[in-house]
């Protein structure tokens, strides 16, 4: 199904406009900002979601040490260019002709340049580390129960195949979720780890992208899991190219 047939809405993306103008009067939904048709049975790509967000009104030690090549999204929001499949174009530019290269999750992976900057290919982010800190609780969560709950969440809510959740680490109050997905592993129809991580990030912030679905209510054996900060690290199949100036 492309959208909920009974009331013509998109369950997986509230930032859409839907109407029964598809083949045979079927409900069809288009992303705000880009006008691209979206498949409402799965997650919408992060590129289209960012574009929609920018078009919307503004008021609307078992722990892993991230590698030296890990990227954090310090640039924040921008209005991206998406390809016809809804993926980020490798080169992004702003209105003042400043350009940079991004990875498959839209995070800058080079220094900023001008229109002459070349980005030969869209480099895949194959490893995402989601670093969470939970609010104080009476005691630590049972690691196995916490691990299973987060794996269930990614399967059920984000439709991410269980094979892509590589590990869940826990040292109270820090939780780390590792998502891994190589180009060769990702089959047609598989949710992209970058899209799942983005939906999760928005859920954690109380900004759910789902339509008509309650916000995220994470519980471990009935005990609420409340996240007070989130950091997401992105590792690309090819290390990023930044000048030494940025590293100092």
């Amino acid at each position: 199904h492309t959208a909920a047939q009974d009331n013509c809405t998109c369950p997986t993306n509230k930032m859409t406009v839907c109407s029964p103008d598809g083949p045979g009067g079927r409900c069809q939904c288009r992303a705000l900002g880009s006008g691209m048709a979206v498949d409402c049975s799965t997650l919408t790509s992060k590129c289209l979601l960012l574009k929609a967000r920018m078009s919307a009104p503004k008021n609307a030690r078992t722990l892993v040490r991230p590698s030296e090549h890990a990227l954090v999204d310090n640039d924040g929001l921008y209005d991206p260019d998406c390809d016809p499949e809804g993926r980020f174009k490798a080169r992004q530019c702003n209105q003042t002709s400043v350009c940079w290269c991004v990875n498959s999750v839209g995070v800058r992976r080079t220094d900023k340049g001008d229109l002459s900057l070349r980005c030969d290919e869209l480099v895949r982010t194959h490893h995402i580390l989601i670093d969470l800190r939970h609010r104080p609780t009476a005691g630590a969560f049972n690691h196995s129960d916490l691990d299973a709950e987060l794996r269930r969440l990614f399967r059920e809510r984000y439709r991410l195949h269980p094979k892509f959740v590589a590990a869940v680490h826990y040292e109270q109050p820090t939780i780390q979720i590792e998502l891994r997905q190589n180009t060769s592993q990702k089959a047609a129809g598989d949710v992209d780890i970058g899209d799942a991580a983005y939906y999760f990030e928005r859920d954690i912030k109380g900004e759910s992208l789902f339509q008509g679905r309650g916000g995220l209510d994470l519980r471990v054996r009935g005990e609420p899991l409340q996240v007070e900060r989130t950091l997401i690290y992105y590792l690309d199949e090819i290390p990023p190219k930044f000048s030494m100036k940025r590293l100092t």
């Epitope: 047939q5 049975s41 196995s144 059920e156 269980p162």
Partner: antibody, heavy 117, light 106 residues
Framework: EVQLVQSGPEVKKPGASVKVSCKAS????????IGWVRQAPGQGLEWIGE????????YYTQKFKGRVTMTADTSTSTAYMELSSLRSEDTAVYYC??????????WGQGTLVTVSS | DIQLTQSPSSLSASVGDRVTITCRAS?????MYWYQQKPGKAPKLLIY???TLASGVPSRFSGSGSGTDFTLTISSLQPEDFATYYC?????????FGQGTKLEIK
Amino acid sequence: EVQLVQSGPEVKKPGASVKVSCKASGFTFTDYVIGWVRQAPGQGLEWIGEIYLGSGTIYYTQKFKGRVTMTADTSTSTAYMELSSLRSEDTAVYYCARGSIFPFDYWGQGTLVTVSS
Amino acid sequence: DIQLTQSPSSLSASVGDRVTITCRASSSVSYMYWYQQKPGKAPKLLIYDTSTLASGVPSRFSGSGSGTDFTLTISSLQPEDFATYYCQQWSSYPYTFGQGTKLEIK
């Protein structure tokens, strides 16, 4: 072709343990989840728990916690469910089922466990 | 735990009849799953994500609903449809099933 083949019927005495096996074929074993569900004679379906085959992560329902053990042998693509301290109410057909982005997409044929003195 | 209550518990109908089975959740769930079980056999996935037919399931089966109220409809009963039907949720641990609806020949 995806297949889950379970071990044969068992008759056990109260207080004993039973170990049911579920041999998988037709898919990459460690990419999936195996859930266990039981059905008492003439009754409905009751979920016991599940094991993530790649990581070994396990979740048991509260009712069975402490009495059930789920394991997997990746070398033989076989999942196991052991239930201890058996009582007559544990008489049921026990099913294994594969999980992916669905809770259960393929099921084993079931194993009848009879607990009787 | 989320309780699922199916109604009716049993139902007699004839070939060609339209049949509706409802499943009510004790709290809101994201999606409902439906299974068909025949005597002596394992359950078979019928409908996932509330309304999507599993592979090989005839189009006479349909599912709908949201929140706490869901339905399974068989538009024109066929002889092979006489079985027991279960709804199931996995929006939160533990996964739970409805008590089942036994569909019998009138």
